[in-house]
Interface confidence: low
């Protein structure tokens, strides 16, 4: 065991701690009557060098002095920073079988003298906190280095604390454990840090500060807010602060926001009125404090107060639209639709809508409340009707929005011209049009309305619509637009008391249909054949069908088939053809065409016309 050193001793010159670049002499001496045998000349002392417990060198060749069989001196150079272990062993040269025996060992530390500590910074957290200082120690010394922090001030105030750095811990901060009170606000204090190790010492420049320079107030606590008269836009923020605070900084934002509203408040005394809050909005509030208007440091931000502002009555106008459907000769069904207010207009949870239908001349009024965004009533077809809707939350109702019920497509002179629908990308369609040519009253606005052309869509799904100012002739529709679906798009031109409309079909993306129409029957009437079919199922259309094609050819013929192309109309499911020869058997089939191409053929049917051909 090298720590016990029963066999001998190891010494280092000039010292076991040396500066980087220096050499050292290590002497290994055997104690009297210790050795391999009675022949001292057979004793051989060797020196082994270990770094991190790993043998890195046998210093046999570095012997500078040798008392045969008693002591040896070795010179070591180029030692790296940190600690190196040297172990002296006794090798008995006349006995090759026995391993060398440890005699003793020594650790040599290589390092540097400490640099003067720099960038001293002191803080006292809160009026009741204690002074703590930190500094930059400079280069690592690789040696145990002691640091002393000394503070001096008025009335012979002195105080000091110590700590040390080594390879396991770093000392660059000390808490002096003393409290500076506000009555010393004008006094000056001096701190100095001294560093010392086995290779030298150094001292920082003196660092001078006042109470206000170093005291960082504690962040405000117990933050709360009172909303004046349950107002959603005005509230008084209250908090607790340390007694000496003269300046506060407030920051607040809606929870989903990315930028803070900032406010500076002087002598707020834990209270500040906010007047620009948004009703019914989740907010986050934080406060910071400072002890002096010009000097000193801001506290950390307080913990957040998160709360929602109260509701206020809705503002803004509802976007209303409607559909009219004649039921019989004297009754019509009116379906009113409206869009939900956005949060900044709703200013609370909308509880219900107040809906009114009024006949202008007879003063008949139908009223109801609903929680839905649509309402349907049957009313007489006679008279001029107007509708109004308002939204209500717990604080009140919005001003009613009025709309005149007119025959939406009743006036041909108001129908927009040259309506087109172009696919822009996967989820929107650009609709363009020209104004009515000979409108006898001014267009007040355009409404672009669209719905998917799928079975039952009129009854199952409310329409989607956009209001367009009268000087605009285009709309990009995107709400609920999906690729490979055909939409019926109507452009309405509305005047004060009339409406005109034009219709077009459009899709945002298309493919050729999956299948062709299914021929269900072929009948002969008055020398013409009538082909009847069922439409392609909605999911298989994959866009707007532009036309159908009916193909026919004589059975067993290898000639190209003839074809007839029919403009697609949803309501049409039969078509006549008249160019077939009687008593010739034909094969007929159909395909469907979208802007992307033609479908595979549908089912084949054979037919042999009997009558006289044209």
């Amino acid at each position: 065991n090298i720590d016990v050193c029963k066999l001998g001793t190891v010494t280092v010159q000039p010292a076991p701690v040396i500066p980087l670049g220096s050499a050292a002499n290590i002497s290994c001496s055997l104690n009297p009557k210790q050795g391999c045998s009675h022949y001292p000349s057979s004793n051989e002392l060797i020196l082994l060098k270990f770094v991190n417990d790993v043998l890195v060198e046998n210093l046999h060749g570095k012997k500078v002095h040798d008392h045969t069989g008693h002591s040896s001196t070795f010179q070591v150079t180029n030692l790296s920073l940190g600690m190196t272990l040297f172990v002296c062993k006794l090798n008995c040269s006349n006995s090759q079988k026995k391993p060398p025996v440890p005699v003793c060992g020594v650790e040599i530390s290589v390092g540097v003298a400490p640099e003067p500590p720099q960038n001293i910074s002191c803080v006292q957290e809160g009026e009741n906190g204690t002074v703590a200082c930190s500094w930059n120690s400079g280069k690592v010394t690789y040696l145990k280095t002691n640091y002393t922090l000394q503070l001096s001030g008025p009335n012979n105030l002195t105080c000091q604390k110590q700590c040390f750095s080594d390879n396991r811990q770093n000392c660059n901060r000390l808490d002096l454990g003393i409290n500076l009170s506000p009555d010393l606000a004008e006094s000056r204090f001096i701190v100095r840090v001294t560093a010392i190790n086995d290779l030298g010492n150094s001292s920082s420049l003196p660092h001078t500060f006042t109470f206000l320079d170093i005291v960082i107030p504690l962040p405000p606590w117990d933050i709360r807010i009172n909303f004046l008269n349950a107002s959603g836009s005005r509230g008084t923020l209250q908090w607790e602060d340390e007694g000496q605070v003269v300046l506060n900084q407030l920051r607040y934002q809606p929870l989903n926001s990315t930028s803070w509203n900032m406010v500076n408040a002087t002598n707020a005394k834990g209270k500040y009125d906010l007047r620009d809050l948004r009703p019914f909005t989740e907010y986050e509030f934080q406060i910071s404090s400072k002890l002096h208007l010009s000097g000193g440091s801001w506290s950390n931000w307080s913990e957040s107060l998160r709360t929602r502002t109260p509701e206020e009555e809705p503002v803004g106008i509802l976007d209303i639209w409607y559909m009219k459907q004649d039921i019989d000769y004297d009754r019509q069904q009116i379906s009113l639709f409206w869009k939900s207010l956005n949060p900044s207009e709703a200013r609370g949870k909308i509880l219900h809508y107040q809906v009114t239908l009024q006949e202008v001349t007879k003063k008949t009024t139908l009223q109801n409340t609903t929680r839905h965004t649509s309402w349907t009533r049957v009313i007489p077809r006679t008279g001029a009707w107007t509708a109004s809707v308002s939204a209500a939350n717990s604080k009140g109702a919005s001003a009613p929005t009025h709309i005149n019920i007119v025959d939406l497509c009743g006036t041909g002179l108001l129908a927009p011209h040259q309506v087109s629908a172009k696919s822009e990308n996967m989820d929107n369609i650009l609709v363009t049009w020209q104004p009515p040519k000979k409108a006898d009253s001014a267009v007040r606005e355009y409404i672009v309305e669209w719905r998917a052309l799928q079975p039952g869509s009129i009854t199952k799904f409310p329409p989607h619509w956009l209001r367009i100012p009268p000087d605009n002739m285009s709309a990009l529709i995107s709400e609920n637009i999906k690729p490979y679906i055909c939409y019926e798009i109507r452009v309405h031109a509305l005047s004060e008391s009339q409406g005109g409309c034009s219709s077009i079909r459009g899709d945002s993306k298309h493919k050729a249909p999956v299948s062709g129409p299914h021929i269900t029957a072929i009948t002969e009437k008055k020398e013409r054949l009538f082909i009847s079919w069922t439409h392609i199922p909605f999911p298989e259309q994959r866009g707007c069908i532009l036309h159908y094609r009916i193909y026919w050819k004589e059975r067993d013929s290898t000639a190209q088939p003839e074809l007839c192309e029919i403009q697609y109309r949803r309501s049409q499911n039969s078509h006549p053809i008249s160019s077939l020869q009687p008593r010739v058997t034909y094969v007929l089939w159909m395909t469907a065409v979208t802007a992307a191409g033609e479908s595979p053929q549908g089912n084949e049917r054979e037919f042999c016309p009997q009558g006289k051909a044209n």
């Epitope: 709360r224 807010i225 913990e303 957040s304 107060l305 998160r306 709360t307 929602r308």
Partner: nanobody, 119 residues
Amino acid sequence: QVQLQESGGGLVQAGGSLRLSCAPSGRTFSTLAMAWFRQAPGKEREVVATISWSGGRTYYADSVKGRFTISRDNAKNTAYLQMNSLRPDDTAVYYCAARGSDYGSYDYWGQGTQVTVSS
């Protein structure tokens, strides 16, 4: 709506320990300030301990200071009350409560869990 469910109550000898848990559901737990109250037979309900939404600030009634510890684990959506050195006068129904911010009245309450300390 927030539902609070306490657990961990029971019978314990004086000097023993219990740990109560409270698991809210129905709202983001990390935005709720939490508290434990208790009500002994024939007495008014009293606050035992409170903890802010971030866990950075706590409060204890004088009668439990140094013996009880309130904590929260926002990752597990749970608030805890560690009760050590229990005394017979700690016997009560313990209620978990929550509020939507670090101020104001407690809006949400649990059903309560019985803690009985025998001598």
